[in-house]
């Protein structure tokens, strides 16, 4: 059995040239005729040179999975799905996303170091000593309040709470 070159496919004991992306095999090669190809019908595609008798069905972006259509399917490219705003891709296969997760909300004591994108979760970072954050979408930790000369410090600030001052 012959081993075919790259971008050829085996038919019986003959190697036939593959069809171009966006096409599928209509008629395999023969003595005088190369591979006869046909364009992929709507909602189907082939992304690479291929020996397929049928094009592949285009993917569908499922809103219940947090997905939206970012790029429509073409005859040579599958649908590209992206996560809806506020979500990021949990399962990425090349440029294809199958499931999305909601962006992490930073807990109290942390700030948003890097905002979440369609393919990356939010990155949180601890507040430095002397600052605090209530968490959520806060990008900066706030400095503790300095009690004035006429006030008394009742409770020292933590990374999640401000200093508590009381009037004398």
């Amino acid at each position: 059995q012959p081993s075919c070159r790259q971008e050829e496919f085996l038919v019986g004991d003959e190697c036939c040239p593959m069809c171009n992306p966006g096409y599928h095999v209509k008629q395999v090669c023969s003595e005088h005729t190369g591979t006869v190809c046909a364009p992929c019908p709507p909602q189907t595609y082939t992304a690479h040179a291929n020996g397929l008798s049928k094009c592949l069905p285009c993917g569908v972006c499922d809103p219940d999975m947090g997905l939206l259509t970012w790029q429509e399917c073409s005859s040579w490219k599958d649908t590209v799905c992206r996560c809806i705003p506020g979500y990021f891709c949990e399962n990425q296969d090349g440029s294809h996303c199958s499931t999305c997760l909601q962006h992490t909300t930073c807990p109290p004591g942390q700030r948003v170091e890097k905002r979440g994108t369609h393919d990356q979760d939010t990155v949180c970072a601890d507040c430095l000593t002397g600052t605090f954050s209530l968490g959520g979408t806060q990008e900066e930790c706030l400095p503790w309040t300095n009690c004035s000369a006429f006030q008394q410090e009742v409770r020292r600030g933590t990374n999640s709470t401000d200093t508590t001052c009381s009037s004398q």
């Epitope: 790259q6 050829e8 005088h32 591979t35 190809c37």
Partner: antibody, heavy 118, light 108 residues
């Protein structure tokens, strides 16, 4: 003698239309697929379109898709190319080609010149 | 689409010399390649099909070889009428049919 003879070329303005014909003689026209191939002045050969012998399968180059229409009348041994929305870059000699060695092109017409210019 | 690249662009030789023209495909076209000759003001003429089969009526000083991605047209001894432009064309996977950009064989 096996022969293909093109006609219908000429000067046309951008956006205009033209219909080319290719008359076949000396062979059983209805048995063969036929191609249109063009050649811009001083340039190489470019495949334009192909129609199968019964006329049921038609293919076009991306550069002409949606603007050109190939057809054939087997009773008249004639091939046609309807060219609409013509552009300056469509200026070329247009050849029809066919032959026994399909899809190799062993019979060619003498060509007809299409000039798209304002 | 499959791109065919011909080399050299121009070949300057004398009558009686051997001419070797190359055609390279961007991916395999098997054995499905033709060579055409075109003289100024004339339609192309089929010389070789199936990479190596000589078209009827073509002198046997013309020969073709190769398969896959690399093909060669050889003219064993150039005659004065052989000075012309030569094109390769693939039909390994179509549509589209594609042609090389041509090699001009000129008198040195």
């Amino acid at each position: 003698e096996v022969q293909l003879l093109e006609s219908g070329g000429g000067l046309v303005q951008p956006g205009g239309s033209l219909r080319l014909s290719c008359a076949a003689s000396g062979f059983t026209f209805s048995n063969y697929a036929i191609h249109w191939v063009r050649q811009a002045p001083g340039k190489g050969l470019e495949w334009v379109s192909t129609i199968s012998s019964p006329g049921s399968t038609i293919n076009y180059a991306d550069s002409v898709k949606g603007r050109f229409t190939i057809s054939r009348d087997n009773s008249k041994n004639t091939l046609y190319l309807q060219m609409n929305s013509l552009r300056a870059e469509d200026t070329a000699v247009y050849y029809c080609a066919s032959g026994y060695l399909y899809p190799a092109m062993d019979v060619w017409g003498q060509g007809t010149l299409v000039t798209v210019s304002s | 689409e499959i791109v065919l690249t011909q080399s050299p662009g121009t070949l300057s030789l004398s009558p009686g010399e051997r001419a070797t023209l190359s055609c390279r495909a961007s991916r395999s076209v098997g054995k499905y390649l033709s060579w055409y000759q075109q003289k100024p003001g004339q339609a192309p003429r089929l010389l070789i099909y199936g990479a190596s089969k000589l078209q009827s009526g073509i002198p046997d000083r013309f020969s073709g070889s190769g398969s896959g991605t690399d093909f060669t047209l050889t003219i064993s001894r150039l005659e004065p009428e052989d000075f012309a432009v030569y094109y390769c064309q693939q039909y390994g996977s179509w549509p589209p049919f594609t042609f090389g950009q041509g090699t001009k064989v000129e008198i040195k």
